[in-house]
């Protein structure tokens, strides 16, 4: 059914879905407060450019005696019930926030008539790619493979001088929501990630990730996985690891790696860890002091989508333009606004873009260090410690694969 | 460990002035939007005024607006609370507080405006 938005003369409305299904087990209460902030900037924004205009806030809970899982696997129905029930309620707003599961996002966007944006804290897999109305304010699966792929292709570093195009991919089914959909997406035959590289195998069970730790006949020296540090020592202890093993450890979401007193253990020596910069510049290769370690990154998303919200409706407003309208749904891309944090890009397909940092960890201080970064905006690494103290021989990342020349 | 230490409370008249100051300690200020709330006798939390991180943003509840002035020194690590034109309504225990979600409080610092 048609249901009207509320979203005109004056008065702007924003749906948030509360969903107990959740990319990341964050309280509820803590993304009311993250919403609640970003209103109360977004109207000071507003009032500031002159626009006497009153913005709400509408959180739609799910009733929780269904799917009650509360992880991803039963939110595709929770999702659709949630807009059921602001269809029999006859009251949408402007914009939809949530859901961030990639499965209630793909049903929802694919069984509605969207004619409003929808803003995504999560919705990680590929299958949420290139919609048209979907804003995704975390890193999707898409900018992962892009980097790996531009990775593995360098060949001109002074740390890493071969071309790799092989790799073993660990997912055992255990993984968190954003990990699990990163891993998909590399184990997808049809993907970017796959028509690149040579040799790929998905690694399922523990025993064989440890068995290829010191495999003589191992098809590839590298080997991708998705978490935490603990993740990756409850999988290898202190096993011996041969010397030309290179873990890639994807750890996005996770700033640990920034604070002051961090002091990598023995078992990282030969993992490089990706995640995302804490900040707005991280160009020298020792972390500054002025990071600090801030684990909000979900709740960070809700607010900024309320940011982007605001942001949207002050050029629309300002242009005279009506909210209700194809073009509004069709707007949130292709631009840069003010974050909370700093300026937040989003691409021609409204997937946010960061700066993802590659870390090792250095054998002289026992520290992570910055080894280069990476923009997803432009596809392009940027080399940050020419001399890395590596484990690795010749301070250098070793060939993919054992006994191989150069490429 | 992350502490706010509020200070500059104290009583004044109608139509005076107090400023007021929070010493933040423990965590990297200067990376933090900060936010004073306040808790009138009998009342829930208002918030009064929010600043970003670098100091680029000020925000101010309408109650408050052209009278308050909310503004900070990173390399202080303080936040500053400037208050003239005070009322009777403007009595209240004012806090310092941390980020979106409020995740760390100082004990307050308690405003009395009264005749």
């Known amino acids: 059914s048609q249901v009207s938005q509320n979203c005109h003369n004056g008065s702007y409305e924003i749906s948030v879905l509360m969903m107990g299904n959740s990319a990341f087990a964050e309280p509820l209460k803590n993304l009311e407060d993250a919403v609640n902030e970003g209103l109360e900037i977004v109207r000071g924004r507003l009032q500031n450019a002159g626009l006497n205009v009153t913005v709400n806030a509408t959180f739609m809970y799910s009733d929780g005696l269904i799917h009650n899982s509360g992880d991803c696997r039963s939110s595709t129905c929770e999702g659709l019930d949630l807009l059921r029930k602001i269809s029999n309620a006859q009251r949408m707003g402007c914009v939809l926030i949530g859901p961030s599961c990639t499965y209630s996002t793909f049903q929802m966007y694919l069984d509605t008539e969207l004619s409003y944006p929808m803003i995504s804290a999560g919705s990680f897999g590929l299958s949420c790619d290139y919609k048209e109305t979907l804003t995704r304010l975390m890193s999707p699966a898409r900018k992962l493979m892009y980097f790996l792929v531009n990775f593995w292709k360098t060949n001109d570093l002074p740390f890493k001088t071969y071309s790799w195009s092989t790799s073993y991919v660990y997912k055992n089914g255990t993984e968190t929501e954003d990990c699990f959909w990163y891993l998909n997406a590399l184990e997808a035959s049809v993907s970017y990630f796959s028509h690149e590289l040579g040799f790929k195998v998905v690694l399922r069970q523990d025993k064989e990730f440890q068995d290829i730790l010191m495999d003589h006949n191992r098809k590839s020296n590298v080997i991708i996985m998705c978490g935490g540090p603990e993740f990756l020592y409850k999988l290898k202890g202190d096993r011996a690891v041969a010397e030309d093993i290179v873990i890639i450890l994807v750890d996005l979401f996770n700033d640990q790696y920034f604070e002051d007193n961090v002091t990598a253990p023995d078992y990282m020596k030969n993992v490089l860890v990706l995640t995302l910069s804490p900040g707005n510049s991280l160009l020298n290769s020792s972390f500054s002091r002025n990071l600090s370690p801030t684990k909000r990154d979900f709740a960070l998303a809700y607010l900024n989508g309320i940011l982007l919200f605001g942001h949207m409706l002050k050029i629309f407003l300002e242009n005279g333009e009506n909210i209700t309208t194809p073009k509004f749904a069709h707007a949130f891309r292709n631009l840069t606004f003010e974050g909370y944090d700093g300026p937040v890009t989003l691409d021609d397909w409204g997937d946010v873009d960061s700066t993802m940092v590659l870390l090792y960890t250095s054998v002289d201080t026992k520290k992570y260090k910055v080894l280069l970064t990476y923009d997803t905006h432009v596809n392009k690494t940027y080399p940050v410690d020419m001399s890395p103290t590596f484990t690795w021989k010749n301070s250098k990342l070793p060939n993919d694969i054992t006994g191989r020349g150069p490429q | 460990e992350v502490q706010l230490v509020e200070s500059g409370g104290g009583l004044v008249q109608p139509g005076g002035s107090l400023r007021l100051s929070c010493a933040a300690s423990?965590?990297?200020?200067?990376?933090?939007?900060m936010t004073w709330v306040r808790q009138a006798p009998g009342k829930g939390l208002e918030w009064v005024a929010k600043i970003r991180h670098d100091g680029g943003e000020k925000y101010y509840a309408d109650s408050v607006k052209g009278r308050f002035t909310i503004s900070r020194d990173n390399a202080k690590n303080s936040l500053y609370l400037q208050m003239n034109s005070l009322r009777a309504e403007d009595t209240a225990v004012y806090y310092c507080?941390?980020?979106?979600?409020?995740?760390?409080w100082g004990q307050g610092t308690l405003v009395t405006v009264s005749s």
């Open positions: 423990g965590f990297t200020f200067s990376r933090y939007w």
């Open positions: 507080t941390r980020d979106y979600n409020k995740d760390y």
